[in-house]
Interface confidence: medium
């Protein structure tokens, strides 16, 4: 083992950690558990304890980021550097950062939790053997009802352990149908649909009717995503594998490496590759977040790399299911902190998460009838309308800043960013925000502290928008974006992650634009942005004045309010309404007087 010059270490034993944001690769509970287990490895052999806290004052701040993520040590895309950590100390010292361009897993492929079946909600095991064939994604083979399933062990033929994968044929999410599965085919606007669709929505989310006729019954749900078969790269990134698919006249019901010299698994994203040529790479095994975190936390505690190839602190990733700590790791950490007081601990045990619904034990083969029990429903909300109330705000939880004249929104000359969130207008300035609801005599509420509600954000924001269905909030500042879902944050991520080049210094606004699309603005340019894929179409770049003639070219904020577009320059706004495909300026006014209804005294 090796430590650092001067044996850098923590000088207290009760270490705190904060999970600042999450990767979308794993369920949050799995990420929480991976970090907790990684810390438990070190606490098991030392006097150290690790306590999760929820503030930036933590000793060890854990963050997912990509490329140059704000600390001077950029990540490098997929593979290569997986993560890095700083030595013990104040501020950023001791922090651990994980490259979100990696596929994070538990080391054995994407984590797909199952329902029903006979595996108590265990995750799929990829690859698995069924009838002598290897499967790297959920399959409908062996079933007549079209329900995708997987084995939860490496070999279904010998172990008979399985569960059902997320599927719209098994359940839907949210919507208003109590989680009932899709009914195919179904009628929507007089047309027949035999698969989930985004038609009728402007946000790109896939949905289905849960009865045969949506027009009559108005019952629907959203279709679950399938991490196991969401492709990367190729020419269809973010799409789902379609099984079976035809390639060179032959049918494939699982990912294949046929036609490639590098052994990488791929699939078609339509039923016929030969005619459509649409494809992508299937998810690989990914990196074990638990093992990488355990290694990084070793660094954050003061351990350098080990020269022992079997040690956890050896500088190469190696997946193992055995006990990760080698004697060399134990000697190193005890050199810094001493041994754990007697008695010696047992190895930490982990419990398998219980399924959300009581499993039904099925016959020895994957069942061919629907499970008798259905999943419990998600929240019921109107099918396509925005939320009925402000989704993220609430005066009860926000700290009101002591009032001074500058804290009156009516005295703010130029706001940093303005956004419609829920049914309210949010106005941001220098670390503070106000909320405004239109109505006779109403005044902006606030100011509140941004840091209280969205602690990961910087004081200065360039633009903000809410994605209405998922209630995701996108916050832009400089070359970075943060995405909040409730109190959880993903980011900061570089604008590169959204497909915006290095020449885009900031995002100055966003407007809704058709199904699942936004327009993102930066100065005089705009791009079409796919909300679901979180990616701009680089070919869609256009000049603002071509699409919105008559607005100023140096706007500092663009936002949508009451279905109209507002372009802000200085204290003024140019309001644009769309009529028969034409965007026309229909009003110019003051933000304070004309939107916030401030008195003109």
């Amino acid at each position: 083992f090796q430590t650092f010059e001067g044996d850098l270490k923590w000088h207290h034993h009760n270490i705190t950690y904060w999970i600042q944001n999450y990767s979308e690769d794993l369920p949050r509970a799995v990420i929480d558990d991976a970090f907790a287990r990684a810390f438990a490895l070190w606490s098991a052999v030392t006097p150290l304890t690790f306590t999760r806290v929820y503030s930036r004052d933590a000793d060890i701040v854990i963050q997912f980021g990509v490329a140059e993520h704000g600390d001077g040590y950029p990540f490098d895309g997929k593979d290569g550097l997986l993560a890095h950590a700083f030595p013990p100390g104040p501020g950023i010292q001791g922090d651990a950062h994980f490259d979100d361009d990696e596929l994070w897993s538990l080391g054995k492929g994407v984590v797909v939790p199952t329902r029903f079946g006979n595996a108590d909600g265990a995750a799929c095991h990829f690859p698995f053997i069924f009838e002598g064939r290897s499967y790297s994604a959920c399959t409908t083979d062996g079933r007549s009802d079209g329900l995708p399933w997987c084995s939860t062990t490496a070999n279904y033929d010998t172990d008979d352990r399985f569960g059902f994968c997320p599927s719209e044929r098994l359940y839907t999410q949210d919507g208003n149908a109590d989680g009932k599965p899709c009914q195919f085919p179904f009628i929507f606007q007089g047309q027949s649909y035999s698969a989930c669709t985004t038609d009728g929505r402007s946000d790109g989310y896939r949905w289905c009717a849960t009865t045969a006729n949506y027009d009559r019954d108005k019952l629907f749900g959203f279709c679950p995503t399938r991490a196991d078969s969401t492709v990367m790269g190729g020419n269809s990134a973010g799409e789902l594998c379609v099984f079976p698919f035809t390639f060179l006249g032959k049918e494939y019901s699982t990912c294949t490496s046929e036609g490639r010299g590098d052994g990488r698994l791929w699939c078609a994203t339509t039923s016929n590759f030969d005619s459509d040529k649409k494809w992508g790479f299937c998810p690989d095994q990914g990196y074990s977040l638990f093992l990488v975190a355990a290694h990084e936390f070793g660094h954050a505690l003061g351990l350098d790399h080990s020269s022992v190839p079997e040690a956890l602190m050896y500088p190469m990733y190696r997946f193992t299911e055995g006990p990760p700590l080698h004697k060399d790791d134990v000697n190193g950490i005890r050199h810094l902190y001493g041994p754990r007081p007697e008695p010696e601990p047992r190895p930490p045990t982990t419990t398998t998460p219980q399924p959300t619904a009581p499993p039904t034990v099925c016959p020895t083969g994957p069942p061919t009838v629907h499970p008798s029990e259905r999943p419990t429903a998600g929240p019921t909300g109107p099918p396509s309308a925005g939320p009925t109330g402000p989704p993220t705000a609430g005066p009860s939880t926000a700290t009101t800043v002591p009032l001074s004249p500058v804290d009156d929104a009516c005295n703010v000359n130029i706001f940093d960013a303005i956004a419609e969130i829920g049914n309210q207008l949010y106005l941001f300035k220098d670390g503070k925000y106000w909320r405004f609801s239109e109505g006779r005599g109403s005044r902006p509420q606030g100011p509140f502290l941004i840091a209280d509600k969205w602690p990961a954000l910087p004081r200065k924001l360039d633009s903000v928008f809410e994605e209405r269905l998922s209630k995701k909030l996108f916050f832009f500042s400089g070359r970075q974006v943060w995405v909040y879902t409730g109190a959880s944050v993903l980011g900061p991520r570089r604008l590169d992650k959204l497909g915006l080049g290095a020449d885009v210094a900031q995002v100055t606004g966003a407007l809704r634009s058709g199904r699942g699309k936004m327009l993102l603005f930066s100065g005089r340019r705009l791009w079409r942005f796919d909300v679901k894929a979180q990616m701009v179409d680089p070919r869609s770049a256009s000049e603002v004045d071509r699409m919105f003639p008559g607005v100023p070219l140096d706007t500092h904020d663009v936002f949508q309010y009451r279905e109209k577009a507002y372009f802000c320059q200085d204290r003024f706004y140019w309001r644009v309404s769309s009529r028969s495909e034409l965007n026309q300026v229909d009003q110019v006014g003051y933000v304070t007087y004309d939107i916030l209804q401030c008195p003109e005294d």
Epitope: G70, K78, I92, Q93, H299
Partner: antibody, heavy 124, light 107 residues
């Protein structure tokens, strides 16, 4: 003993190109973050470009963005800087520098080894 | 970008005297500061990393202190070989930036 040896400098006309190389020895090159730093005659130090250990991440000073390309060949323990569309203001001694930070253990701010430098003169 | 301002621009001292060189960042950089020494015709040499840690082979008369925005390089007793230009450099925020340098000359 750690050594960094630059080569490839010389006199070039404005708009021309040069490729600098930096041969590294005495350390595990593939694990370290590497840099190019330049110094115009009689002036201070200016960061030019950065590359991560795998080569997957590269960054550039605004003054050279779009004209210079940093790369590395870990099998040859060599760092490169391809300089195109050279301007008079690019005239400087170019140093390659090894970061103290390596692999996933970061936080050590400082370049602990530097090459002897190679002079690039852009003039007509 | 973070601006690094060094003072004084030139410092004239005699051998055996104590030298105090200052470096100020335009915003907080925690302890991510390094000091370099450069002699004419030579490459810079790392003296101090992370504000206060002496690099390998650097004599004990060199010490660094400070965090946040204000940093100091101290040479407790000047030796003839210490006369050179000294640069500070930050990595607390991207992009990294150098100070303009302090020339230490013999009085």
């Amino acid at each position: 003993e750690v050594q960094l040896l630059e080569s490839g400098g010389g006199l070039v006309q404005p708009g021309g190109s040069l490729r600098l190389s930096c041969a590294a020895s005495g350390f595990t090159f593939s694990r370290y973050h590497m840099w190019w730093v330049r110094q115009a005659p009689g002036k201070g130090l200016e960061w030019v470009s950065y590359i991560s250990p795998s080569g997957g991440s590269t960054l550039y000073a605004d003054s050279v963005k779009g004209r210079f390309t940093i790369s590395r060949d870990n099998s040859k323990n060599t760092l490169y800087l391809q300089m195109n569309s050279l301007r008079a203001e690019d005239t400087a001694v170019y140093y390659c520098a090894k970061d103290r930070a390596y692999g996933d253990y970061v936080g050590w701010n400082g370049f602990d080894y530097w090459g002897q430098g190679t002079l690039v003169t852009v003039s007509s | 970008d973070i601006q690094m301002t060094q003072s004084p621009a030139t410092l004239s001292l005699s051998p055996g005297e104590r030298a105090t060189l200052s470096c100020r960042a335009s915003q907080s950089i925690s302890s991510f500061l390094a000091w370099y020494q450069q002699k004419p015709g030579q490459a810079p040499r790392l003296l101090i990393y992370d504000a206060s840690y002496r690099a390998t082979g650097i004599p004990a008369r060199f010490s660094g202190s400070g965090s946040g925005t204000d940093f100091t390089l101290t040479i407790s007793s000047l030796e003839p070989e210490d006369y050179a230009v000294y640069y500070c450099q930050q990595r607390g925020n991207w992009p990294i930036t150098f100070g303009q340098g302090t020339r230490l000359e013999i009085k």
